[in-house]
Structures are given as C-alpha cells and as structure tokens.
C-alpha cells in the first residue's frame, strides 16, 4: 500500500482477530504483528526494495508520464507463517505450527 | 499501481525504450508492451487476483480501519520476457531471446 | 580477429549421419549463442537452431526436431552439429554463425549420395 | 513460423544506380530484421541489423528502413562489388525465417 513521503518498508500491523471476525475460528493468538509494507517507491529504486526490472520499466514511465502511468507499489515480497490454534472443521481444537503467509517478512516495489 | 474504482487487472503500457533511455543499448524492439496492473483491491477479494492470506486480512483491516491501514495493492504477480537485441559490453549487437521479468503476465493483490 | 573455422567437406550415404564442428577463435566462445544454417546448391538459407554454449540448451527448427542435435565443448571453443538419418536432400553446404549473425564460418559442404 | 517475402526475386540494374529491395514479413517483426549479402561460394555477410543499423565496415550506400511488417533495403549507389543476392531475416520469433532472396544481376 502506499505511504506519505517516506520510501517503501516494512512497518507494524497489529491485528486483532476479533476486529476482523476471525476470531470465530481462531483460538489463539488474540492478535499478532501482520506487519504491512508501506512507503513509496520513487525514483531511483534502491537495491533493498529489490525491484523487478518492470518495477524499474515502470517507475522510468512514471518518471517521463507521471500522470500516465502509476509508481511501483511498495508490497510483500516475501511472507513468514505464524503459529495458530484454530477448530477445525469437527470444531476440534488443532494447533498448526506453520500457518503460510499471515505476515510480512520483506518488503519490495513492484 | 493504483487505479481509480475498476478492480486490480492487467492493461496495456506501451513502452518506448528512447522515453526512458534504454536505446542506448537497446537495439531492438524500439518498443514493447509492458502491461501495468491498475485498478483497486477491493472487499471481497476475488480469486481472479490470486490474493494471499496477508492481502485478505489487510484487507478486512482496512474496512475496519480505513484511515489506519491501506487496502492491498494491485501488482504484477507473474512476468513475462521479452526478445531483445542489445549491445553488450563489447558493442556487439546481442540477441536475449529470454530478457526475463520485463513485462506482466498476471496481476493480484498484495 | 574473430572467426569461425569449420570443419571440411563430407560425402555420406543416405541413412548415415554427419557431424560438423565449428571452432570460435578471437572472442569469449560462451558469450554467444551459435546458429546453424544450410543451404542446398542453387537455393536460399535455411535456419536450423542453436545452442547456448554456456548451459548447452538448444532450439531446433521444427523440419530438424528429432534429426539435428547440437552440443558444443567449451574447453576447445568448438560447436557440433549433428544430422542423422541424411537423405538426398540434406545436400548442402552448412554454415556455423554467430548469435546475431555477424560473424559465419566458411562453410561445409555435405554431399549425401548412394 | 514467420514467413518472409522478398521482392522482386530478381533486378537488373547498372553501375551507379539506387537499387530497392523490400521485404515483407507475414506478421509484426517490430525491428527485428537483418539484411545479408551473399556472393557465389562464399557465406552470406550482415549489412544491416534491428532493420536500419549499419554493420561495423559495411559501405554507407546500403542503408535499410521500415518495422512492423514492411522493409527495404536500398543501395543509392550500384558499385560493381554489390552484384550478390541479398537475403531478409526475421530474429522476432525464436524459429528464424529468412527471405528466398533477391538477386542483383549487372544489366
């Protein structure tokens, strides 16, 4: 998502699951850090937003036509598990140690 | 890059390497077809933008919190090649059948 | 200078195979794909694929798929081009041509006759 | 595959004459078109690349235009060393097509 002035990084998200109506199914936790990528991705784009080359295409564009064509958006690039207890389908409590992409581990522009 | 009230999908952005200074070395095409991925990540993620778990929940963040958190954002998820013609280092014209992630295939929200 | 030497002319009976090298001098052999190209006498070119000398992937026009294989040996700076299962119409002369085409071997001729 | 079409397949012309050979390919090529001179027993040679560059050496009375689909090779000038048979190629697609060709022959 985008951001003020600042350029594009990772910065905290705490998220309640009973804000979001997850807590229906998940036990625990009661909230965790999601995280959230938020900055801009200006010109010229650094090597730690590790941007594709249609990032940089795009961001060039953007540069000659800026109200052509859109900046590079400042996103996940890469997503770590989290651990959860949740009830499953029985409404049995399960406990899943590597619950895929629920929060951010790197930012980029793309 | 963000769209107006469409939702996330992929659209021409025709390139021309002269506007953003890649004839230089470029040779051939004089331009291609970049796509861009324009338009909005909007409650209910549809499956057609491939959304992630992290997407979904900053998405329920955002209809919570809208001042608070931004919604996902709609980006390349999967890159073509292109064919090139470029100079290398020894100004030999070169052709890159696979000059790969330079133009979007697939567009999700991230 | 850069060049390309090739190996020299080849009489073979229908059936039988051939293979021609093609030996790069003057440049970085891996920088550069390798094209084959024919041409049978009196008559236009013909593209037949290349190799990458640095992975050994290659791309064969689809008249040759299943009768040409391309190999190469980097440590002699040297491309082979294989064609089997040679009938009458394989007569021709056969180029080695570097990635862009700006650099061709002398030639060498195939004669396929029983 | 690309089909390339060269026309005319042959020309007679004389010393000193503009001389134009077209190519046509039988679908968008963008600017990925070479040009090749080729004399009897000997292998073909570039002149021109990416449809109007000039190769490294070639005489400045060749010069080549056009993309997309629509090509031409022009030599202002006939010097007795050009009567050959000029060949276009298509490198847009990875299965490469050239031209039948079109010879240059002195009138």
């Known amino acids: 998502s985008t951001g003020a002035s600042s350029h594009c990084q990772k910065t905290s998200l705490r998220v309640n699951f009973e804000d979001i109506g997850w807590d229906s199914w998940i036990i625990a936790p009661k909230e965790y850090d999601a995280y959230e990528c938020k900055g801009g991705c200006f010109f010229p784009l650094a090597d730690d937003v590790t941007p594709t080359k249609h990032a940089i295409v795009q961001t060039l564009v953007h540069l000659k036509f800026p109200t052509k064509v859109g900046k590079a958006c400042c996103v996940p690039t890469k997503l770590s598990p989290i651990s959860i207890l949740y009830k499953d389908d029985m409404g049995v409590p399960t406990l899943k140690y590597h619950y895929e992409g629920m929060s951010v581990a790197e930012c980029g522009c793309r | 890059s963000t769209g107006a009230s469409s939702h996330c999908q992929k659209t021409s952005l025709r390139v021309n390497f002269e506007d953003i200074g890649w004839d230089s070395w470029i040779i051939a095409p004089k331009e291609y077809d970049a796509y861009e991925c324009k338009g909005g990540c909007f409650f209910p993620l549809a499956d057609d933008v491939t959304p992630t778990k992290h997407a979904i929940v900053q998405t329920l963040v955002h209809l919570k919190f809208p001042t608070k958190v931004g919604k996902a954002c709609c980006v390349p998820t999967k890159l073509s090649p292109i064919s090139i013609l470029y100079k290398d280092d020894m100004g030999v014209p070169t052709l890159k059948y696979h000059y790969e992630g330079m133009s979007v295939a697939e567009c999700g929200c991230r | 200078q850069v060049q390309l030497v090739q190996s020299g002319a080849e009489v073979k009976k229908p059936g039988a195979s051939v293979k021609v090298s093609c030996k790069a001098s003057?440049?970085?052999?891996?920088?550069?794909?390798m094209n084959w190209v024919r041409q049978a006498p009196g008559q236009g070119l013909e593209w037949m694929g290349w190799?990458?000398?640095?992975?050994?992937?290659?791309n064969y026009a689809q008249k040759f798929q299943g009768r040409v294989t391309m190999t190469r040996d980097t440590s002699i700076s040297t491309a082979y081009m294989e064609l089997s299962r040679l009938r009458s119409e394989d007569t021709a002369v056969y180029y080695c041509?570097?990635?862009?085409?700006?650099?061709w071997g002398q030639g060498t001729l195939v004669t396929v006759s029983s | 595959d690309i089909q390339m079409t060269q026309s005319p397949s042959s020309l007679s012309a004389s010393v000193g004459d503009r001389v134009t050979i077209t190519c046509r390919a039988s679908?968008?090529?963008?600017?990925?078109l070479a040009w090749y001179q080729q004399k009897p027993g000997k292998a073909p040679k570039l002149l021109i690349y990416?449809?109007?560059n000039l190769q490294s050496g070639v005489p400045s009375r060749f010069s080549g235009s056009g993309s997309g689909t629509d090509f031409t090779l022009t030599i202002s000038s006939l010097q007795p060393e050009d009567f050959a048979v000029y060949y276009c190629?298509?490198?847009?697609?990875?299965?490469?097509?050239f031209g039948q060709g079109t010879k240059v022959e002195i009138k």
């Open positions: 041509a570097r990635n862009y085409f700006d650099v």
């Open positions: 003057g440049y970085t052999f891996t920088s550069y794909y």
């Open positions: 190799i990458n000398p640095v992975q050994g992937n290659t």
């Open positions: 679908q968008t090529i963008s600017n990925f």
């Open positions: 990416a449809a109007s």
């Open positions: 190629q298509q490198l847009y697609a990875e299965s490469i097509t």
